[in-house]
C-alpha cells in the first residue's frame, strides 16, 4: 500500500529485569526526511485531541531533544532509514507495547513493537534430534530468544552436572528478522550416556548462573553383554564339562534373541543364556561368545578361549627345501598337534636318534651329500609323548665330483692327427646328462663323454671337459702337446731402422712365431739361389743390384716352412742421367725440339732442373723441355739435373744443333 510507511523489525522482543533490549529496526517514510520522533510506552489514541497519550520514553524534534529518560533509552536511527532503539537497563514495567511515533514534513505514522520483560532470566530451550544412536554424531542445540549488545551472556553445556569436553559453537542474531543467542554442540554419544541428564546453562559474563534447561538422553544401543565361564581359566582336559553364562548389562530397546558362536560360527539349538558343554573333545577348543540382538542390532560379548588339552598327535616333518643343493642351508620342522604345545622333541636321521637335537626346528647351515636320507621326529608335552610319523626324505644334489679329461691316443701327437679324449667322473646327483669341452670347436662326439678331434691343429694346446647335471664341473685342462712345423715364418729387416740407402749396412732376420720341437735350421734364397744357412742375412754395403725378392725357410723334424717373398728396396740418388733429343740432336729452325731428362732413381725423380751451355737455369720444372719454335741461336749444349729424396744427379752435356731452314738460306 503506497499510503503506508514501511517498517521492518522483530514483532516481539524478550528480556528480563536489569538486562537490556536492543531493537533492530528499518523504515521508509512516505515523503522526505524524519522531522520528529517520539517513543511511547503503551500509547492510546485520544480521539478528542487527535493525539497519542502514554509514557514518553524518548523524544526528539527538529527543535531539539526532550531530556526524559534519554540516558536509558537511545534512538540509534537516522532521518530516513534506520530506526534502531536501545533500552538499558530494561525493567519489568517496560513490558507491553512500544510505540514509535514518526513525523515527516507532511506525513505521520505510529509503529508498534511488543516488549516482554520477565522478572527473572527465562530458560533457554534444548533441541534434540528425533532419535539418538550410539556412536552416531548428533548436534545438540540450545536456543535463547535474547541478545543485546549491552548485556553479554554465555551458554554452557553440562553432562550429569559436569561441563562437557566437546567444543560448542555459539552464534548470535541481532537483525530485523530475529534476535537470539544459540549454542550448538556436536557429540557422539556412547551407550553409557543413555538416561544421562544434559543441561544448557545460561550464565552472565562472569559465569554466574541465570537459568537453565535440561533433557534426559535416550541413546539407542545394541545389547551390552558379559560372559562368565566355569572353570574360570577355560582350560580343561578331554572329557571334562564346561558351563558358560551370558549376562545383559544394558539394552535399549529391549533385546529380542540370544545365540552362541564358536570361532565366529553360530552354534545350532543354543538359544538360552547358558551354554553347557559335557565331555568336551579337543575339537571343541576355540573362541566362544554370546550374541544378543535388539532393534538396533546384535551385540556380542568378549570372546572366551576354551582350551581342551591333549597329548601330541603323530608327528610329520616339513623340509625347507628338498631337494637341497650341497652347501646350502636346510631347516627341518617337526609338526605335531598338541595342547599345551610340545616342550621337547626327539629327532631321527635314517632311524638313528640325532644327539642334542630337542627343538621344534633343526637347522643345518651347510648341507653335505651325507646329510641325505629320512628325517622323523617325536613330540612330547605334559600329557604324554606322541608317536613317530612316517618322516620326510632329504635329497642332496651336487655337481659331478672328481672330473678328469683323459687322452686315449699314443704320444706324441702331431699336427693333423686324429685325437680321441674321454671325460670321466666319480659321482653325481642328479645323473650326468651332458658334457662340455673347452675350447669349442667343430669336433665330433661319437658317444656321450667322448670327443674326437679330426686333423688336430698346431694350436690345440690344452683341452678341458665338464660333466654336467644341473651344474657343470670342469676338469683340469690336459696338454695335447701337439708337434708341428715352424709357423709364421717371415723376413724382418733389423737394420737400418729406416729406409735402405745405397751403401748402407743391411741385416735381415728370419723370424718365426713358434716351432715344436724347438730345434730348427734356416735357409736364405734369392731368385731360387741359396744365399746362407744362418738366421740372419747381412750386407756390408748394399748396392741397387742387391734389390730383389728374398725368402727364408725354417725346418724342424716335422717339416719346413717358407716365408712370403720379401722385397728388398734400395734407395739411391738419381744416376745414369742423360739428355735425349726428339726428333734428334739436329733440328731445323722453326720446328719443335723436345729434350727429355732420362735417369735411374729410387724413389723416382721428383724435380728436374734444366741448364744451358753457360750453366744458366731454364724456367722448366718437368722431365721434358720443349722449344717451339726452335731458333738457330738455341744451338748449344744442354744438361739436366734430377732430384729425389736421397739426393741429386746430373747428366753430361748433350748438344742440340739447329740449322737454317731452306727459306732462310734462300733469303740470304
Amino acid at each position: 500500500d503506497s499510503s503506508k510507511w514501511v517498517f521492518e523489525h522483530p514483532e516481539t522482543l524478550y528480556a528480563w529485569e536489569g538486562a537490556c533490549v536492543w531493537i533492530p529496526c528499518t523504515y521508509r517514510a512516505l515523503d522526505g526526511d524524519l522531522e520528529s520522533f517520539i517513543l511511547f510506552h503503551n500509547p492510546e489514541y485520544n480521539k478528542n485531541t487527535s493525539k497519542f497519550d502514554g509514557t514518553r520514553l524518548y523524544e526528539s524534534t527538529k527543535d531539539g531533544k526532550v531530556p526524559s529518560e534519554q540516558k536509558r533509552v537511545q534512538f540509534l536511527g537516522d532521518k530516513n532509514k534506520n530506526c534502531t532503539l536501545s533500552i538499558h537497563p530494561v525493567h519489568l514495567n517496560d513490558s507491553g507495547q512500544l510505540g514509535l511515533r514518526m513525523e515527516s514534513k507532511t506525513e505521520k505514522w505510529m509503529e508498534r513493537i511488543h516488549l516482554n520483560v520477565s522478572e527473572r532470566p527465562f530458560p533457554p530451550h534444548i533441541q534434540l534430534p528425533p532419535e539418538i544412536q550410539e556412536s552416531q554424531e548428533v548436534t545438540l542445540t540450545c536456543l535463547l530468544n535474547f541478545s543485546c549488545y549491552g548485556y553479554p551472556i554465555q551458554l554452557q553445556w553440562l553432562l550429569e552436572g559436569v561441563p562437557m569436553r566437546q567444543a560448542a559453537v555459539t552464534s548470535t542474531s541481532l537483525t530485523i528478522k530475529s534476535v537470539f543467542t544459540r549454542s550448538e554442540l556436536k557429540f557422539s554419544p556412547q551407550w553409557s550416556h543413555h538416561g544421562k541428564i544434559v543441561t544448557c546453562q545460561l550464565q552472565d559474563a562472569d559465569g554466574k548462573f541465570l537459568s537453565n534447561d535440561t533433557v534426559q538422553l535416550n541413546v539407542k544401543h545394541t545389547p551390552k553383554l558379559e560372559i562368565k565361564v566355569t572353570p574360570s581359566d577355560a582350560i580343561v582336559r578331554e572329557g571334562d564339562s564346561v558351563t558358560m553364562t551370558c549376562e545383559v548389562s544394558s539394552s535399549n530397546p529391549e533385546y529380542t534373541t540370544v545365540s552362541w558362536l564358536k570361532d565366529g560360527t553360530s552354534l545350532k539349538k543354543q538359544n538360552t543364556f547358558t551354554l553347557n558343554l559335557r565331555e568336551v573333545t579337543k575339537d571343541q577348543s576355540g573362541k566362544y561368545c554370546c550374541q544378543v540382538s535388539n532393534d538396533v542390532g546384535p551385540g556380542r560379548s568378549e570372546e572366551v578361549f576354551l582350551q581342551v588339552q591333549y597329548a601330541p598327535e603323530p608327528s610329520t616333518v616339513q623340509i625347507l627345501h628338498s631337494p637341497a643343493v650341497e652347501g646350502s642351508q636346510v631347516e627341518f620342522l617337526c609338526m605335531s598337534l598338541a595342547n599345551p604345545l610340545p616342550t621337547n622333541y626327539t629327532w631321527y636321521h635314517n632311524g638313528k636318534e640325532m644327539q642334542g637335537r630337542t627343538e621344534e626346528k633343526v637347522h643345518i647351515p651347510k648341507i653335505l651329500p651325507w646329510h641325505a636320507g629320512t628325517y622323523s621326529c617325536v613330540a612330547e608335552n605334559i600329557l604324554g609323548t606322541g608317536q613317530r610319523g612316517p618322516g620326510a626324505e632329504l635329497d642332496v644334489q651336487y655337481p659331478p665330483k672328481k672330473v678328469t679329461t683323459v687322452i686315449q691316443n699314443p704320444m706324441p701327437i702331431r699336427e693333423g692327427d686324429t685325437v680321441t679324449l674321454s671325460c670321466n667322473y666319480n659321482s653325481s646327483n642328479p645323473s650326468v646328462t651332458r658334457y662340455e669341452w673347452k675350447p669349442h670347436g667343430a669336433w665330433e662326439e661319437p658317444s656321450l663323454g667322448v670327443l674326437k678331434i679330426q686333423n688336430v691343429g698346431w694350436d690345440n694346446t690344452t683341452i678341458a671337459c665338464a660333466a654336467c647335471n644341473s651344474w657343470c664341473s670342469w676338469a683340469s685342462p690336459v696338454a695335447l702337446n701337439v708337434q708341428y712345423a715352424p709357423r709364421d715364418v717371415r723376413v724382418r729387416k733389423i737394420k737400418p731402422l729406416s729406409e735402405i740407402h745405397s751403401g748402407n749396412s743391411v741385416s735381415l732376420q728370419c723370424d718365426f712365431s713358434s716351432s715344436h720341437p724347438k730345434e730348427v735350421q734356416f735357409f736364405w734364397e734369392k731368385n731360387g739361389r741359396l744365399l746362407g744357412k744362418e738366421s740372419q742375412l747381412n750386407f756390408d754395403s748394399i748396392s741397387p743390384e742387391d734389390a730383389g725378392s728374398y725368402s727364408c725357410w725354417v725346418n724342424n723334424s716335422i717339416g719346413q716352412t717358407a716365408s712370403k717373398a720379401w722385397t728388398l728396396e734400395v734407395l739411391y740418388a738419381p744416376r745414369r742421367l742423360r739428355v735425349s733429343m726428339s726428333p734428334g740432336d739436329q733440328v731445323m729452325e722453326g720446328k719443335s725440339a723436345t729434350l727429355t731428362c732420362e735417369s735411374d732413381a729410387n724413389p723416382p725423380v721428383s724435380h728436374y732442373t734444366w741448364f744451358d751451355w753457360n750453366n744458366q737455369s731454364l724456367p722448366y720444372h718437368s722431365q721434358k723441355l720443349r722449344l717451339e719454335p726452335v731458333k738457330v741461336q738455341h744451338s748449344g749444349a744442354y744438361w739436366c739435373q734430377g732430384t729425389n729424396s736421397v739426393g741429386k744427379g746430373r747428366s753430361p752435356l748433350s748438344t742440340l744443333t739447329v740449322y737454317y731452314s731452306p727459306e732462310t738460306i734462300g733469303r740470304r
Epitope: 744451358d612 753457360n614 737455369s617 731454364l618 724456367p619 720444372h621 718437368s622 722431365q623 720443349r626 748449344g636
Partner: antibody, heavy 125, light 112 residues
C-alpha cells in the same frame, strides 16, 4: 720498386694485328732469373696465359697452343721493354691484356709466380 | 688444357674463416709445388697473395694462408674483413705440352 707500364691501342678491327708494349722499370728484361709474360682476361675464358720471353745465354720464348702460329713476343733491350703481337684477331680476342713478371728464384730455392703485373689494357676487337 | 676448378662463390661474416679450393691434376697442382693465389678487385690488376703453395710475399696479411693435398690446393682467409671482398684466382705450373701456366676459374668472395 719494379713496375710494368703497358701501352697500345684499345680498339682493333677484325683480321688486323693487335700490338701492345710493356715497359719495365726497376728490373732488366735481360735478367737471367725472370721471365716476361703476357696474360689476358675475358668473361668467357677467365685468366689465360698467352706466352713468355726470357734471356739466358740467348733469347727463348714459349706460347700457349691456343694462340701459337699467330702470336709473337719481341724485345727491345735498348728501351728495356717487350711487346705482344697477335695477328688475325677476331671478336673472341676481346679482353683485358696484362703483362707480368715471373720471378723464378726465391733466395736459393726455385720459385714460380707472377709477382708484378702491368695495369692492364682493355682491347676490343 | 682445361682450367683449374674453383667454387664460383664463397661467403662469410666479418671475423669468420673461409677456405677456397682449387682442384687440378697430377700434371699441374699435384705434380709441382708451384701453386700461387691472386686477389683481384674490380677494375684492378691481379695481386699476388700466396706463392709456391704456402709462401706469403712481404706486405700480405698473415690472415691469408695456403696449403695443398694431392691434386687440390686451398686458400684460407681467417678473420674475414670487408676489404677481402674480391675475386680470387689460383695458378699452377703445368707439364702440359699446350701451356706452361694454367689459371683457376675464379671465386667471388662476399663479406656478409
Amino acid at each position: 720498386e719494379v713496375q710494368l707500364q703497358q701501352s697500345g691501342p684499345g680498339l682493333v678491327k677484325p683480321s688486323q694485328t693487335l700490338s701492345l708494349t710493356c715497359a719495365i722499370s726497376g728490373d732488366s728484361v735481360l735478367s737471367n732469373s725472370d721471365t716476361w709474360n703476357w696474360i689476358r682476361q675475358s668473361p668467357s675464358r677467365g685468366l689465360e696465359w698467352l706466352g713468355r720471353t726470357y734471356h739466358r745465354s740467348t733469347w727463348y720464348d714459349d706460347y700457349a697452343s691456343s694462340v701459337r702460329g699467330r702470336v709473337s713476343i719481341n724485345v727491345d733491350t735498348s728501351k728495356n721493354q717487350y711487346s705482344l703481337q697477335l695477328n688475325a684477331v677476331t671478336p673472341e680476342d676481346t679482353g683485358v691484356y696484362y703483362c707480368a713478371r715471373d720471378r723464378l728464384q726465391d733466395g736459393n730455392s726455385w720459385s714460380d709466380a707472377f709477382d708484378v703485373w702491368g695495369q692492364g689494357t682493355m682491347v676490343t676487337v | 688444357q682445361s682450367a683449374l676448378t674453383q667454387p664460383a662463390s664463397v661467403s662469410g661474416s666479418p671475423g669468420q674463416s673461409i677456405t677456397i679450393s682449387c682442384t687440378g691434376t697430377s700434371s699441374d697442382v699435384g705434380g709441382y709445388n708451384y701453386v700461387s693465389w691472386y686477389q683481384q678487385h674490380p677494375g684492378k690488376a691481379p695481386k699476388l697473395m700466396i706463392y709456391d703453395v704456402s709462401n706469403r710475399p712481404s706486405g700480405v696479411s698473415n690472415r691469408f694462408s695456403g696449403s695443398k693435398s694431392g691434386n687440390t690446393a686451398s686458400l684460407t682467409i681467417s678473420g674475414l674483413q670487408a676489404e677481402d671482398e674480391a675475386d680470387y684466382y689460383c695458378s699452377s705450373y703445368t707439364s702440359s705440352s699446350t701451356l706452361v701456366y694454367v689459371f683457376g676459374t675464379g671465386t667471388k668472395v662476399t663479406v656478409l
